[in-house]
């Protein structure tokens, strides 16, 4: 990334689309939550991410090279009854017209008697909504995700079965003081009560009926983080996720 | 329903200062990035200062760095522009516009407040 | 920085005409061109965005074109309502530019 433009603007967590590239290691991350290299662990002789090209490149077809954005699927569709699906999706009731894949298996309304099937790990996910509101939103934020990822997702339960999502108060990073920036226009002192601007919640990845349709599903969280960091990196993400991680040994109460 | 009311505007002599606020209302106001935007008389648009309030990351054009600061508080989902050293050439319709695309600034202004007119003159 | 040059500067047209408007970029900017549409006293109206989408509640008649470096905005048959001050805008990088307007006037 020879841009001195670049260079200044890289980890102000703004994405600027000038900077948004491989070489400049998606404007530092700022395109990217956070993640500067998403196909780091991909082995392809192919640029992967140069091939985000709506048409099958087997050689990024791997979970390691993000499946090549799932563009090697013979029979990519569309949900027919999206609205009626996105209603009741994960509900408890099962629409048998809503259990596909492009319409997320009726969020597992049809394979509940089916065992489980884990991913390996934690997505840990930081987004702009404070909790009361996303947990209100859970079915619609999982299904989101779900689409994006090819498979189903489920927030994790602490080791009280308290679902782990957790109020999100920003972070007073290098990255945030990079231009002398604060949050609020009040002095350090009066910053004591905390204001909640999001939440950070803990994912799992439900394979079970992945497994049936599928030769693309992830087994750890891993590529699935960076995948929804490609997605952000295009522009896809339809709400406003602020970073992403994958944790494959995760502690269960961890804030 | 997604709206932006500026306020702040007024007359204000060369050298002067003024501090313009933009009230976001119907949205997420943290997610969204939010732009400065003036038209002086009779002439095209000009964009001023971008802010992302998640963050507090701050873009400016050059013709008004280091006399303009644009910052946000999130607990009142308001963005304010704070003018000093002002100039002649500072006088314009000010309007603040959300960005579509959350952490961008590269996404288009798809919600402008109503203007708040800015004078500067002696 | 980019700058953004729009042509013509003003037209003169009657309902029902099509209408062309181009923007030109001092350099690529891939897509990432807005056009905007502004009356007299009112603030400016997103029209269209990623140089061909239209926003929200934006009539079909307006259709927006190009990549890279050459852009247009068309209106295919103008309206009454359509007689407004039109502005392409760069959203590739910062400093964010304008284009300089293109006043469409009724014949």
């Known amino acids: 990334c020879q841009s001195q433009y670049c260079a200044d603007k890289a980890r102000d967590g703004i994405c600027d689309e000038a900077c948004n590239s491989h070489a400049c290691q998606w404007d530092g991350g700022d395109c990217s939550l956070t993640m500067e290299d998403p196909w780091a662990n991909c082995t392809s002789t192919l640029r992967c991410w140069e091939y985000i090209n709506n048409q099958c490149d087997e050689q990024c077809n791997t979970a390691e090279c993000l499946f090549d954005n799932f563009e090697c699927q013979r029979n990519s569709k569309t949900c027919k009854y999206d609205k009626y699906c996105a209603d009741h999706f994960k509900d408890n009731h099962c629409d048998q017209g809503c259990n596909s894949e492009e319409c997320g298996w009726d969020g597992l309304d049809c394979a509940s008697d089916q065992p489980e099937n884990l991913a390996e790990g934690t997505l840990i996910i930081v987004v702009l909504l404070p909790p009361e509101q996303l947990l209100q939103d859970s079915r619609s934020f999982l299904r989101a995700l779900g689409t994006l990822l090819h498979t189903n997702l489920r927030i994790k339960q602490d080791s009280q079965g308290a679902l782990m999502v957790y109020p999100y108060f920003g972070e007073k990073s290098a990255a945030m003081k990079k231009q002398k920036m604060t949050r609020r226009s009040l002095p350090e002192e009066q910053e004591q009560e905390q204001e909640v601007i999001g939440s950070k919640i803990f994912l799992e990845i439900d394979n079970r009926q992945c497994v049936q349709d599928s030769d693309q599903c992830f087994k750890n969280t891993d590529a699935a983080a960076a995948l929804l960091a490609s997605h952000a990196i295009q522009g896809t993400l339809s709400y406003p996720l602020v970073s992403v991680f994958s944790e494959l040994e995760s502690p269960r109460n961890a804030q | 329903e997604v709206q932006l009311v500026e306020s702040g505007g007024g007359l204000v002599q060369p050298g002067g200062s003024l501090r313009l606020s933009c009230a976001a209302s119907?949205?997420?106001?943290?997610?969204?990035?939010m732009s400065w935007v003036r038209q002086a008389p009779g002439k095209g648009l000009e964009w001023v200062s971008y802010?992302?309030?998640?963050?507090?990351?701050?873009y400016y054009a050059d013709s008004v760095k280091g006399r303009f600061t644009i910052s946000a508080d999130t607990s009142k989902n308001t963005a304010y522009l704070q003018m000093n050293s002002l100039r002649a050439e500072d006088t314009a319709v000010y309007y603040c516009?959300?960005?579509?695309?959350?952490?961008?600034?590269?996404?288009?202004?798809?919600?402008w407040g109503q203007g708040t007119l800015v004078t500067v003159s002696s | 920085d980019i700058q953004m040059t729009q042509s013509p500067s003003s037209l003169s047209a009657s309902v029902g005409d099509r209408v062309t408007i181009t923007c030109r970029a001092s350099?690529?900017?891939?897509?990432?061109l807005a056009w905007y549409q502004q009356k007299p006293g009112k603030a400016p109206k997103l029209l269209i965005y990623?140089?061909?989408s239209r926003a929200s509640g934006v009539p079909s008649r307006f259709s927006g074109s190009g990549s890279g470096t050459d852009f247009t905005l068309t209106i295919s048959s103008l309206q009454p309502e359509d007689f407004a001050t039109y502005y392409c805008q760069q959203y590739y990088s910062s400093p964010l530019t304008f284009g300089q307007g293109t006043k469409v006037e009724i014949k």
């Open positions: 516009a959300r960005h579509s695309g959350y952490y961008r600034i590269s996404s288009a202004m798809d919600v």
């Open positions: 802010i992302y309030p998640y963050s507090g990351a701050t």
């Open positions: 350099q690529s900017i891939s897509s990432y």
């Open positions: 990623g140089a061909s």
């Open positions: 119907g949205y997420s106001f943290t997610s969204y990035g």
